[in-house]
Interface confidence: low
């Protein structure tokens, strides 16, 4: 049986080496000499030759320091063996303990360490966390027992212990009040690690501390009255710009202002705010009515899209707004009037009335008529009541004033406002037709040669409307008929074809043609033919003495 | 032309409720407000409210803000005023009054008597 | 609320006569005030609004001046119909207030 008493061996030993640790025995030592070997890591094994046993007395000895550090513990075998070299017990498990020395100070796992915590934070609000590691021996010595403590803050503002930290975690927290981001948006705090419970070896990292912003200023008007002008009647306008400022963080929702007006009943005015700088930008919601209030007083109140953390006063500001007189022209109604009327309406009879509004209906200004565009002079209109009447007879079928039986007349009314307004309505006369005109004959002017003439087609037209055109009805009168002869040349009878009985000499003829409409209004046209020197189709020939009723007449 | 045409006079108890109208003509309905006016026998005018029928808005003299109830029909330009739990204080004569700010027309009165 | 103050409750005055109905206004309420008159049986009538611009059909022999806190409505050459009571309106906040009225009374 072994006899092997426990091994320790304290890391960092001075010399000299070998050292003994201790002495192993065999019992079987009293039956025969025995030899002691060992064998494992630090005996033969890397790293090889740390420990050595001597062979006869079973002193096992230490070489060199050891570094609990790099190996805790050694694991050997002890061996035992007879002069013939037979082994005499069992190999035997040896456990050598290396005991720690405080030989490795602190580390800190970073040498910056960041953290934030919002400004007006309540003592005990815990910011962050600094660690630090130590390679003794934590278990069985205090040479790894850290303690942390702050050594400096920088700035000392408001108070020279804003923080503190917790000595056995390394949780930073808030100790005192006053944390101000606008003051003092950051701290730097030099942290130090201390083994042996804080009395050995030290470290030191630095703990950078953000304060981060909480909306704890408000938004503030300067100036606080602010005057603006704006014409009557212009929605979105731009009355003028509110300024503010706001200490807390720029372009963050504590800093952003949102302005509302505390007295805008009627929801005439609108501020929106400018992104860039904050700036309230005061607008007309919709048009102003000078005749019903010239001046606004509004209170602008200006807050944060967030609301306040803590209780804050809201800034007002007070906008004298004075709304500018447009004296507004007076509105036709409908601005587009159409009348129908039948073209021999009456001269002098009143066709209708048209009339403006003032825009502004409890101001009643005096309206005055006049007629601006009447091309055809047809029309006079009533200053006073805008009753218009015919000075003229009309014309359906004037089409040089008259497009698509429509007569356009533009009609203009004044105010008596300061200054004078003008409104325009526009007065579509639709003409109906009356029958006023009889139908003529298309050319009048008509060329036969002397030789085989070609019949010639005279067309019908009527200026009027359908009933009172087509079918037509032709006839040649005094005596025409003697030398031509006319016949139809469709069904509706809106053109004839005329072609001489005989050969005729060549001259000049006078043929009279009456024409008369589908509702028998007539009228006789003289058609003036020259039968010239040619055969078949006739092109334009000399001019000889007009014949009466188809025959030439002598000079 | 404008008129603002006013239901009839009521006789009603205390603690009863009534909904007096003002019925609009001659202009735009929308356009302006509609305001309330109490005139008590033999005293000044007292302003009550006022709706704005394009979206509904009203506003309130806070000493009426639980005696009243402003509201408009719209499509018969017609405004309504509601009291509630009258007393004998609040016989009087009412006016609806148009004008986006100052009363420009003025309807003739609806005479309301409280009495026991 | 802004109180406005007729401080006349009574005014006697002679046909063809000029008289001028105060009021005045416990701030500033600019020029945001109207007059109205209120003939015994009827609804009041707008004569002056934005405290000196004349309303449509009235007659000029009503005028209305003033602005901030004091104001006046002179009415020049009275007639017999002038017999009537004469109210003060601010419009410049919520709530409204109209003055206490004064009344106007022919000789």
């Known amino acids: 049986d072994w006899v092997i008493p426990p091994i320790s061996c304290p890391e960092n030993e001075k010399g000299p080496f070998p050292k003994n640790l201790v002495q192993i025995k065999s019992n079987k030592d009293k039956e025969g000499k025995v030899f002691y070997s060992i064998t494992g890591q630090g005996a033969d094994t890397p790293p090889v030759g740390v420990f050595i046993i001597e062979r006869e007395t079973g002193w096992l000895k230490v070489t060199e320091p050891l570094d609990r550090e790099r190996i805790a513990t050694y694991t050997l075998f002890s061996h035992a063996v007879s002069s013939n070299g037979n082994a005499v017990e069992d190999p035997m498990e040896i456990l050598i303990t290396v005991t720690d020395q405080n030989d490795n100070k602190p580390e800190f796992t970073q040498e910056v360490f960041k953290g934030s915590v919002m400004e007006g934070a309540l003592p005990g609000t815990s910011v962050m966390e600094v660690t630090a590691t130590d390679a003794d021996d934590d278990v069985n010595t205090y040479n790894a027992a850290i303690a942390y403590t702050i050594l400096s803050q920088d700035p000392e503002l408001p108070d020279k212990n804003m923080f503190t930290i917790n000595r056995n975690t390394g949780v930073i927290s808030v100790v005192t009040t006053g944390l101000d981001r606008e003051s003092f948006p950051t701290y730097t705090l030099v942290v130090q690690a201390a083994d042996l419970q804080g009395e050995g070896l030290s470290t030191t990292a630095t703990a950078v501390i953000t304060v981060t912003d909480t909306n704890d200023n408000p938004p503030i008007f300067n100036p606080t009255t602010y005057k603006g002008q704006v014409p009557e009647n212009e929605a979105n306008v731009v009355i003028t710009t509110l300024k503010v400022t706001d200490a807390d963080a720029p372009n963050t929702p504590a800093w952003e202002a949102v302005y509302t007006i505390l007295n805008d009943d009627g929801g005439q005015f609108v501020v929106t705010t400018n992104p860039v700088n904050n700036d309230g930008i005061l607008k007309t919601a919709k048009g102003l009515d000078f005749e019903a209030k010239q001046q606004y007083i509004l209170h602008v109140a200006v807050t944060n899209v967030v609301p306040f953390e803590v209780s804050l006063t809201t800034s007002t500001a007070t906008v004298t707004v004075d709304v500018l007189d447009v004296n507004e022209a007076p509105i036709f109604v409908p601005p587009e009037k159409r009348v129908e009327v039948s073209e021999d309406f009456g001269v002098g009879q009143e066709i209708t009335s048209y009339t403006a509004q003032e825009p502004d209906t409890f101001m009643e200004q005096k309206i005055t008529y006049r007629i601006w565009r009447d091309t055809a002079n047809w029309l006079e209109i009533n200053p006073d009541t805008g009753a218009i009447s015919t000075r003229a007879e009309l014309d359906r079928e004037d089409f040089e004033h008259v497009k698509n039986s429509t007569y356009t007349a533009l009609i203009i009314a004044t105010d008596n406002g300061s200054p004078v307004a003008t409104g325009t309505g526009t007065l579509l006369l639709i003409l109906s037709d009356v029958n006023d005109n009889a139908p003529i004959p298309e050319p009048r002017t008509i060329f036969f040669c002397e030789r085989n003439p070609k019949p010639q087609v005279i067309n019908i037209i009527d200026a009027d409307l359908p009933p009172n055109t087509s079918p037509f009805t032709a006839e040649l009168t005094h005596g025409a008929s003697a030398n031509w002869t006319i016949q139809y040349n469709d069904p509706t009878q809106e053109s004839i074809i005329l072609k001489p009985k005989m050969a005729l000499e060549v001259g000049d003829y006078k043929i009279n043609l009456k024409l008369m409409d589908n509702q028998n209004k007539d009228q006789v046209t003289t058609l003036e033919v020259s039968v010239c020197d040619c055969e078949g189709a006739a092109g334009v020939c000399r001019k000889a003495q007009p014949v009466e009723a188809g025959l030439q007449i002598p000079a | 032309e404008v008129q603002l045409q006013q239901s009839g006079p009521e006789l009603l108890k205390p603690g009863a409720s009534v909904k007096i109208s003002c019925k609009a003509s001659?202009?735009?309905?929308?356009?302006?407000?509609m305001h309330w006016v109490k005139q008590s026998h033999g005293k000044s005018l007292e302003w009550i409210g006022n709706?704005?029928?394009?979206?509904?808005?009203?506003g309130y003299n806070q000493k009426f803000k639980t005696k009243a109830t402003l509201t408009v029909d719209n499509s018969s330009s017609t405004a309504y005023m509601e009291l509630r739990s009258l007393t004998s204080e609040d016989s009087a004569v009412y006016y609806c009054?148009?004008?986006?700010?100052?009363?420009?027309?003025w309807g003739q009165g609806t005479l309301v008597t409280v009495s026991a | 609320d802004i109180v406005m103050t007729q401080s006349q409750k009574f005014m006697s005055t002679s046909v063809g006569d000029r008289v001028s109905v105060t009021c005045k206004a416990s701030?500033?309420?600019?020029?945001?005030v109207a007059w109205y008159q209120q003939k015994p049986g009827q609804s009041p009538k707008a004569l002056i609004y934005?405290?000196?611009y004349r309303y449509s059909v009235v007659p000029d022999r009503f005028t209305g001046s003033g602005s901030g806190t004091d104001f006046t409505l002179p009415i020049s050459n009275v007639q017999s119909e002038g017999l009537a009571d004469y109210f003060c309106?601010?419009?410049?906040?919520?709530?409204?207030?109209f003055g206490g009225g004064t009344k106007l009374e022919i000789k």
């Open positions: 009054a148009i004008g986006n700010y100052w009363f420009a027309f």
């Open positions: 001659g202009y735009t309905f929308t356009d302006y407000n």
């Open positions: 709706i704005y029928p394009y979206n509904g808005g009203t």
């Open positions: 701030q500033n309420v600019a020029i945001n």
């Open positions: 934005s405290a000196s």
């Open positions: 309106l601010q419009y410049i906040n919520y709530p409204y207030t």
